[in-house]
Interface confidence: low
């Protein structure tokens, strides 16, 4: 396929990536699926600079990112290494809290209202951010 050279309509370009910011809420899995259908993924935050960019656009609202520990260890949806990568958890987080009464712990990460991260119940209907890399080959057929 051809390389994507500019961001789709209604997406925001930043540092060779394109970002789409939802204005409605979905459970984490539905948000993840939404991004995949757009040939993208839930946002993967790899630096303080990217954190500030996303934070500026989402404002002080709970927003899903592409980080989860549903299978045990924390993992980024695009395969970025969690252990050695950028992290911005709130103090005492993640805590896999079980006291919410919804069953299970907390397996999905979101930006909190000050931008730092928290783990929460994946079923909560939070906003989300999709990201796709500009240099990634798109799924569209090449122009002949």
């Amino acid at each position: 396929g051809s390389e994507r050279t500019c961001c789709p309509v209604n997406w925001v370009e930043h540092e060779r990536s394109c970002y789409w910011f939802s204005r409605s809420g979905k459970a984490w899995a539905d948000a993840d699926n939404y991004c995949r259908l757009e040939d993208a993924h839930l946002v993967v935050v790899t630096s303080w600079e990217e954190q500030k960019f996303v934070q500026h656009h989402i404002g002080p609202v709970n927003t899903w990112m592409g980080l989860h520990d549903q299978n045990g260890p924390w993992k980024w949806v695009d395969g970025t290494d969690y252990e050695t990568g950028f992290k911005n958890w709130r103090p005492e987080q993640p805590d896999d809290w079980y006291g919410h009464g919804l069953g299970g712990g907390e397996d999905c990460a979101h930006f909190t209202d000050d931008g730092r991260w928290n783990d929460d119940v994946c079923q909560r209907p939070y906003r989300w951010v999709c990201e796709t890399e500009l240099d990634k080959a798109s799924q569209e057929p090449p122009l002949l």
Partner: antibody
Framework: EVQLVESGGGLVKPGGSLRLSCAAS????????MNWVRQAPGKGLEWVSS????????YYADSVKGRFTISRDNAKNSLYLQMHSLRAEDTAVYYC????????WGQGTPVTVSS | DIQMTQSPSSLSASVGDRVTITCRAS??????LAWFQQTPGKAPKSLIS???SLQSGVPSRFSASGSGTDFTLTISSLQPEDFATYYC?????????FGPGTKVDIK
């Protein structure tokens, strides 16, 4: 328009109790953490308590721990502060404020603890 | 707990003056600092969050900078409605703490 309206303040004797309410409108209440902040007469601002958007996480200032209880009802877009064992030093205007940024504030409700 | 200090505690200035207020945290708070303005008898108003981001509707004469432990709030050209008390606040960790305030009054 974002609005926060506190109520429930008043005059109470030392050792007494009060329940403050904060009615929120104009925003998605269940997406935001909420806070109580107070200001004693002629003094500065003092953070009292915070509660996360879902109510999962709760924090208190040492000065009120064990006496005050913060809670919220997302179905009613309301925040509460139950205050017990009130002391003269709790006399203040109590404000609710939105999010960890404290980006929006109510007008405040005065609490006077005096015999 | 993180202690917040402000200087000066008060200052007298004239309309049109450039005013700078400093805030210091007892330990590093990255950029988790906010500034508030309060006029007598009114609720505080949020001016700036994340150390330097102006809140919506705040005039551009207000600016702020800093990271770690040292922060500044600057009013480039003081207007009559700016005479008030200014507070900084850290939200890096609980308990959230405010500075003692800086009162800006008319010279």
């Amino acid at each position: 328009e974002v609005q926060l309206v506190e109520s429930g303040g008043g005059l109470v004797k030392p050792g007494g109790s009060l329940r403050l309410s904060c009615a929120a409108s104009g925003f998605t209440f269940n997406s935001y953490s909420m806070n109580w902040v107070r200001q004693a007469p002629g003094k500065g601002l003092e953070w009292v308590s915070s509660i996360s958007s879902s109510g999962s996480y709760i924090y208190y200032a040492d000065s009120v721990k064990g006496r005050f209880t913060i809670s919220r009802d997302n179905a009613k877009n309301s925040l509460y502060l139950q205050m017990h064992s009130l002391r003269a030093e709790d006399t203040a205007v109590y404000y609710c404020a939105r999010s960890n940024l404290f980006d929006c504030w109510g007008q405040g409700t005065p609490v006077t603890v005096s015999s | 707990d993180i202690q917040m200090t402000q200087s000066p505690s008060s200052l007298s200035a004239s309309v049109g003056d450039r005013v700078t207020i400093t805030c210091r945290a007892s330990q590093g708070i990255s950029n988790y600092l906010a500034w508030f303005q309060q006029t007598p008898g009114k609720a505080p108003k949020s001016l700036i969050s994340v150390a330097s981001s102006l809140q919506s509707g705040v005039p551009s004469r207000f600016s702020a900078s800093g990271s770690g432990t040292d922060f500044t709030l600057t009013i480039s050209s003081l207007q009559p409605e700016d005479f008030a008390t200014y507070y900084c606040r850290q939200y890096h960790s609980y308990p959230f703490t405010f500075g003692p305030g800086t009162k800006v009054d008319i010279k």
